[in-house]
Amino acid sequence: FERTRSLQDPCSNCPAGTFCDNNRNQICSPCPPNSFSSAGGQRTCDICRQCKGVFRTRKECSSTSNAECDCTPGFHCLGAGCSMCEQDCKQGQELTKKGCKDCCFGTFNDQKRGICRPWTNCSLDGKSVLVNGTKERDVVCGPSPADLSPGASSVTPPAPAREPGHSPQ
């Protein structure tokens, strides 16, 4: 079947990095500069992505694969394949329409991106606050108040801070 197909369609023999050139009797021609084909049998090569402006080149374009971009320092990637760059903020801040703003009291952000999230409510787990929260850090919950009463035989180690969430994008 493969042999039959290749007889019927000479383009199927053109490997990645080439295209089937109709102008040259369907000869396999190399992709021109700044273009690529990532699969065989293509009739055209795709234009390489250019990492301009806020984008930096993470991986150069080759004849068989597109360029890959990331963001200039102070920005981070958004979207599939880093389609956009979004500015970083400091820890303890979140990005708003008015730029980077400090987290409100009772919320924190321990990353340079994403949103401020509420401190853990230790009392929901029957625990007490061992270390107060800040704009940059969640509270650390400790043993329940009952565990700290005189005569208590052991102290429960503090629960690990909860896993940071991810902001919706």
Epitope: G53, L78, S83, M84, E86
Partner: nanobody
């Protein structure tokens, strides 16, 4: 080709004014938030201002609030930054950038940038 081209930079004395322009082509300008960023010599990129699709929402970094105004003319595919009461610390290369459309992408992400226009504030 999607493109942004800035103009209007130059040398100005402290207290003076400049108006930067940015002309967009290759996309539907009125669908996007637009932004100005700047990069002072030896510093990182800093967000300056942004404006929503119809110009009804405008936001500024604190250091330029009350001195700079951002506006747009969707009929002319143009974005503007009016800079008044300029200070030495406003010296920078100014870039206009396309933001998100607010629907399929983040308001705050950017993808298309101009080549920049240089503003020098000096006596």
């Amino acid at each position: 080709e999607v493109q942004l081209v800035e103009s209007g930079g130059g040398l100005v004395q402290p207290g003076g004014s400049l108006r930067l322009s940015c002309v967009a082509s290759g996309f539907t300008f009125s669908n996007y938030w637009m932004m100005w960023f700047r990069q002072a010599p030896g510093k990182g990129l800093e967000w300056v201002a942004n404006i929503n699709q119809d110009g009804s929402e405008k936001y500024f970094v604190d250091s330029v609030e009350g001195r700079f105004t951002i506006s747009r003319d969707n009929a002319k595919n143009s974005l503007y930054l009016q800079m008044n009461s300029l200070r030495a610390e406003d010296t920078a290369v100014y870039y206009c950038a396309r933001g998100g459309d607010g629907y399929s992408s983040s308001h705050y992400g950017t993808d298309v940038w101009g080549q920049g226009t240089t503003v020098t504030v000096s006596s």
